[in-house]
């Protein structure tokens, strides 16, 4: 008899999830010599252990600690790039500026980027039909807790001048409810981080407003300053320049600036 399966509001686990994670891990460790020591089977086992057989609305950051431990990685000071609501452009940037890193350029972020997963209580099966939606079902689901965990860790380990790319086309340029606003901002360590520099990316071709004066940016400045971290903001126009460099990765002058 087919077993009854809980119906969640969100889409189910990405097809071929175990194979995808394992393949990504192998690829990452091949490309990044400093991570060659990582055993990808152990990584998958730790990943699986965080959510398999567990009620998918009761996942904790503790569940992911074995995985976090295996994926420990450090970013050089001044090279961390956070982002909010502008993922693709942030990734285009680090694709060109190879010495800067978003969370998705690190092993754990790379493994999980754009994937969905969940299991079921008391069974070893992966649920490919549906997974909990953050709004409609619960916030302590496997995907949300994963990103909260690794985002917290990413922010905690950042040092020097940290950059954040923000979407100037959104009504809330800085959103307190985003992962950046709710997790990363509060986990930057004042004793290690000397400044946060926000890059507000303008969308409009003819846009020449000063979005660094936006009330939500003032709010971000206030939060950061209260944490004894200096705050800077820059208007960034012509985001199409990022893609132009990405299209020609062989052009080394795109990488170095000049």
């Amino acid at each position: 008899l087919p077993r009854w399966r809980q119906q969640w509001s969100g889409s189910g686990t990405t097809s071929r999830f175990p194979e995808t994670v394992l393949a990504r891990c192998v690829k990452y460790t091949e490309v990044h010599p400093e991570m060659r020591h990582v055993d990808c089977q152990s990584v998958w086992d730790a990943f699986k252990g965080a959510f398999i057989s567990k009620y998918p609305c009761n996942i904790t950051e503790e569940d992911y600690q074995p995985l976090v431990k295996l994926g420990t990685q450090t970013v050089p000071c001044n090279k961390t790039l956070l982002w909010s609501r502008i993922k693709d452009l942030a990734h285009q940037f680090t694709q060109v500026q190879r010495d800067m890193f978003t969370l998705e350029d690190m092993l754990l972020g790379y493994l999980a980027d754009d994937l969905t997963w969940c299991g079921e209580f008391n069974t070893f099966e992966i649920n490919y039909q549906s997974c909990p939606d953050w709004r409609k079902d619960c916030s302590n689901n496997p995907v949300s807790v994963f990103w909260k965990t690794v985002s917290r860790r990413f922010a905690e380990t950042a040092c020097g001048v940290v950059h954040v790319m923000l979407n100037g086309s959104r009504s809330k340029i800085f959103d307190k409810n985003s992962t950046f606003g709710s997790v990363e901002v509060h986990n930057l360590q004042p004793e290690k981080v000397q400044a946060l520099e926000a890059w507000v990316i303008h969308g409009g071709r003819e846009d020449s407003r000063d979005l660094c004066q936006d009330p939500t940016i003032k709010e971000l400045e206030s939060i950061i300053s209260k944490r004894n971290i200096r705050f800077f903001c820059k208007n960034i126009y012509r985001p199409d320049k990022f893609l132009q460099c990405v299209k020609n990765p062989e052009d080394s002058s795109c990488l170095s600036g000049i």
């Epitope: 500026q97 208007n235 126009y237 600036g257 000049i258």
Partner: antibody, heavy 120, light 108 residues
């Protein structure tokens, strides 16, 4: 190494036209915004026009809008500036300049310039 | 449009520090670039992104940008640094502006 060589300058009467060219080499031309900047004799620098790498976006200073047209041929690694309805105040050395990439909008490399003189 | 204001001239003794200012409304919200231009030559980028030095530019050149003012600092100024210096910024659309330029004179 990066090289930018302007040509096409000369003496032209007010109301006349001129087409400047800039031959680029030493970098992937289509990756960069390109610009024209001018300098009147004994005066400061003035940005004239810019064009994106693809080249779907063009920008003009108010002083030349409607009279000048910037264009590029990525297959020939060449930047152009078509100047119509020229005025005495357009007299200047015209420089072709390559933009910085990514978040920066300044000029990494400049040509040696070509002199445009508008006079009757 | 933002307007960039520079002093017309700055004088400095050899070996001393020269500071050239560039002011504009909320200039700290925009990246600033500095160019050196010697007579009869094309401008050369000496500082980009407020404070970054292109390769080949001596370490004595540095830049900063806070409040409404960006500053180009030349430490241990040498005779060869005598030139015109221009600041520049970009405030979107067709608003790419240069300051009026500062003539740096190295005395002696």
């Amino acid at each position: 190494q990066v090289q930018l060589v302007e040509s096409g300058g000369g003496l032209v009467q007010p109301g006349g036209s001129l087409r400047l060219s800039c031959a680029a080499s030493g970098f992937t031309f289509s990756s960069y915004y390109m610009n024209w900047v001018r300098q009147a004799p004994g005066k400061g620098l003035e940005w004239v026009s810019g064009i994106s790498g693809d080249p779907s976006n063009t920008y003009y200073a108010d002083s030349v809008k409607g009279r000048f047209t910037i264009s590029r041929d990525n297959s020939k690694n060449t930047l152009y500036l078509q100047m119509n309805s020229l005025r005495a105040e357009d007299t200047a050395v015209y420089y072709c300049a390559r933009d910085l990439p990514l978040v920066y909008t300044g000029f990494a490399y400049w040509g040696q310039g070509t002199l445009v003189t508008v006079s009757s | 449009d933002i307007e960039l204001t520079q002093p017309p001239s700055v004088s400095v003794a050899p070996g001393q520090t020269a500071r050239i200012s560039c002011s504009g409304d909320n200039l700290r919200h925009y990246y600033v670039y500095w160019y050196q231009q010697k007579p009869g030559q094309a401008p050369v980028l000496v500082i980009y992104g407020d404070s970054k030095r292109p390769s080949g530019i001596p370490e004595r050149f540095s830049g900063s940008n806070s409040g409404n003012t960006a500053t180009l600092t030349i430490s241990g100024t040498q005779a060869e640094d005598e030139a015109d210096y221009y600041c520049q910024t970009y405030t979107g659309g067709a608003s790419l502006v240069f300051g009026g330029g500062t003539k740096l004179t190295v005395l002696g």
